[in-house]
């Protein structure tokens, strides 16, 4: 004997997030009389998606006019699909009953899969800066994508990196997934201008991968090299001593001049020059009045860079090489912001 069949012709439907899903359903008979309902999932915990008879379902529209008595098309459209809508949808015919309608027959179900784009990859580096020759870790995270298949690559200045580990979570079935990857990068002195790039490719991106970047300038610390030199005599009793602070990064630097271990002057690097590789150079000089000294003077340039322990370089100033002038223990004139007289 012929009996109503509920036909869901599509075993599965794949829809991009934000789009509209069409779930097709045909009843092959007008008998028995009774409404159609759509559910997500089966069994007691199933979720009502649409009820032809009653209720408000703002995201659902019917493809055909279900008020028409002769209608056998019970297909629906669900708007603004999100990964949370994924699941198996059942079209169920009910037989008119009293007091309640009775479930008569269900379709085989249509599995709705949602294609969701991954979020823009976020790359984060280490909390503290590291110096060249050290290995640092970068992490890359992207969330909310579906299906699970995804490809992640790391690059440093366009060169692909190979030392990284990637996980996609969760391992089992889920409405959407996240990816987490950690790459190890060896720093070099030339990395101030370098970039680390995390590239994510997914079916939803149509061959146009998403990229997240981190500038190594946020990660690297290049410690300075110091050189203290004595310049030719300006005046008979004055010596100009310079401290060249070279190739440092970042700019945050404090320099202290010590005379025989006593603080003479402290200053902060301001007017620096930038090298092609992004590091900085700075020079401080000290004008020393040697006539004020009976003994040799040990001048020390002490640099504290980016909050690190101070490094220093010393220079011995031979007083005997300069004949003393009587009465010359008065302060000499300051001739520059970086000049200082030693009494």
């Amino acid at each position: 004997e012929e009996e109503l069949q509920v036909i869901q012709p599509d075993k599965s439907v794949l829809v991009a997030a934000g789009e509209t899903a069409t779930l097709r359903c045909t009843a092959t008979s007008l008998i028995p009389v009774g409404p159609i309902q759509w559910f997500r999932g089966a069994g007691p915990g199933r979720e009502l998606i649409y009820n032809q008879k009653e209720g408000h379902f703002p995201r659902v529209t019917t493809v055909s006019d279900l008020t028409k008595r002769n209608n056998m098309d019970f297909s629906i459209r669900i708007g603004n699909i999100t990964p949370a809508d994924a699941g198996t949808y059942y079209c169920v015919k009910f037989r008119k009953g009293s007091p309640d309608d009775v479930e008569f027959k269900s379709g085989a179900g249509t599995e709705l899969s949602v294609r969701a784009k991954p979020s823009a990859p976020v790359v984060s580096g280490p909390a503290a800066r590291a110096t060249p020759q050290h290995t640092v870790s970068f992490t890359c995270e992207s969330h909310g994508f579906s299906p699970r298949d995804i490809t992640l690559k790391w690059f440093k200045n366009g060169n692909e990196l190979s030392d990284f580990q990637t996980n996609v979570d969760p391992v089992g079935e889920s409405v959407s997934y996240s990816i987490h990857s950690t790459a190890k990068v060896v720093l070099t002195r030339e990395d101030v201008h370098s970039q680390v790039i995390c590239e994510v490719a997914h079916v939803t991106l149509q061959g146009d991968p998403l990229r997240g970047t981190a500038n190594l300038s946020e990660t690297i610390r290049v410690p300075p090299t110091l050189e203290v030199t004595q310049q030719p005599v300006r005046a008979e009793n004055q010596v100009n001593v310079t401290c060249q602070v070279r190739k440092f990064y970042p700019q945050r630097l404090q320099l202290t001049w010590l005379e025989n271990g006593n603080v003479s002057r402290t200053e902060t690097a301001s007017t620096v020059t930038e090298n092609k590789d992004g590091t900085y150079n700075w020079m401080s000089w000290l004008l020393v009045n040697v006539s004020a000294h009976r003994d040799d003077v040990k001048l020390t340039c002490q640099v504290e860079h980016d909050g690190q322990p101070a490094v220093s370089k010393s220079h011995d100033l031979k007083v005997s090489a300069h004949p003393k002038e009587q009465g010359s223990n008065t302060a000499a004139e300051n001739t520059g912001s970086n000049e200082r007289n030693i009494y």
């Epitope: 004997e1 012929e2 109503l4 097709r24 045909t26 092959t28 008979s29 007008l30 008998i31 009389v33 493809v63 055909s64 006019d65 008020t67 028409k68 008595r69 002769n70 209608n71 056998m72 098309d73 297909s75």
Partner: antibody, heavy 121, light 107 residues
Framework: QVQLQESGPGLVKPSQTLSLTCTVS??????????WEWIRQHPGKGLEWIGY???????YYNPSLKSRVTISVDTSKNQFSLKLSSVTAADTAVYYC?????????????WGQGTLVTVSS | DIQLTQSPSSLSASVGDRVTITCQAS??????LNWYQQKPGKAPKLLIY???NLETGVPSRFSGSGSGTDFTFTISSLQPEDIATYYC?????????FGGGTKVEIK
């Protein structure tokens, strides 16, 4: 008054695809009030229902022909079409397009005049 | 598929006679039944829908009745222009099916 007119070749070779178009005038195919259907009648025989289409694109085909039949709609031209593949002499018939009301009058209240398609080499 | 058995397959009657055609469905189709008239070389024409409702413009001598599995089509007073083949059609179940037809002739 709605009118339906079938058009297409009257002779089709065996194993080829039969293609017919039904042009609707005096009414909109996209109104949502009707199913648009194809019915055929073998010479001297009774009527055989082939299938129908709704303006949304929803279709249902007679299972006896399902593997070979496609009905499509072009709302911009106010037309719907029938394609029947791998034809044999048994597909020789007069092919009718018709309109079936979804409300009020439920039968096929408007028909084309029919077009005879002969399958022969 | 639902089988529709029409009887008789043909009949001959005089002008003015009452003509009755029956259509039996292989199972309950409620009142989802139509009756068509087809004249030679023409397309079928809808006469009765929902087993008993007269289509607009159809003469009142045509009528239909029945529900479930047994249906009757009647021409109360046969007219010469009624010479045609009459078909019942069910639309309760897909695919729709037609009866084999009843050819009506004038004696």
């Amino acid at each position: 008054q709605v009118q339906l007119q079938e058009s297409g070749p009257g002779l089709v070779k065996p194993s080829q695809t039969l293609s017919l178009t039904c042009t609707v005038s005096g009414g909109s195919i996209s109104s949502g009030e009707y199913y648009w259907e194809w019915i055929r009648q073998h010479p001297g025989k009774g009527l055989e229902w082939i299938g129908y289409i709704y303006s949304s694109g929803f279709t249902y085909y007679n299972p006896s022909l399902k593997s070979r039949v496609t009905i499509s709609v072009d709302t911009s031209k106010n037309q719907f079409s029938l394609k029947l593949s791998s034809v044999t002499a048994a597909d020789t018939a007069v092919y009718y397009c018709a309109r079936e009301g979804l409300d009020g009058s439920y039968g096929s209240s408007a028909w084309g005049q029919g077009t005879l398609v002969t399958v022969s080499s | 598929d639902i089988q529709l058995t029409q009887s008789p397959s043909s009949l001959s009657a005089s002008v003015g006679d009452r003509v009755t055609i029956t259509c039996q469905a292989s199972q309950d189709i409620s009142n989802y039944l139509n009756w068509y008239q087809q004249k030679p070389g023409k397309a079928p024409k809808l006469l009765i829908y929902d087993a008993s409702n007269l289509e607009t413009g159809v003469p009142s001598r045509f009528s239909g009745s029945g529900s479930g599995t047994d249906f009757t089509f009647t021409i109360s007073s046969l007219q010469p222009e009624d010479i045609a083949t009459y078909y019942c059609q069910q639309f309760a179940y897909l695919p729709y099916t037609f009866g084999g037809g009843t050819k009506v002739e004038i004696k």
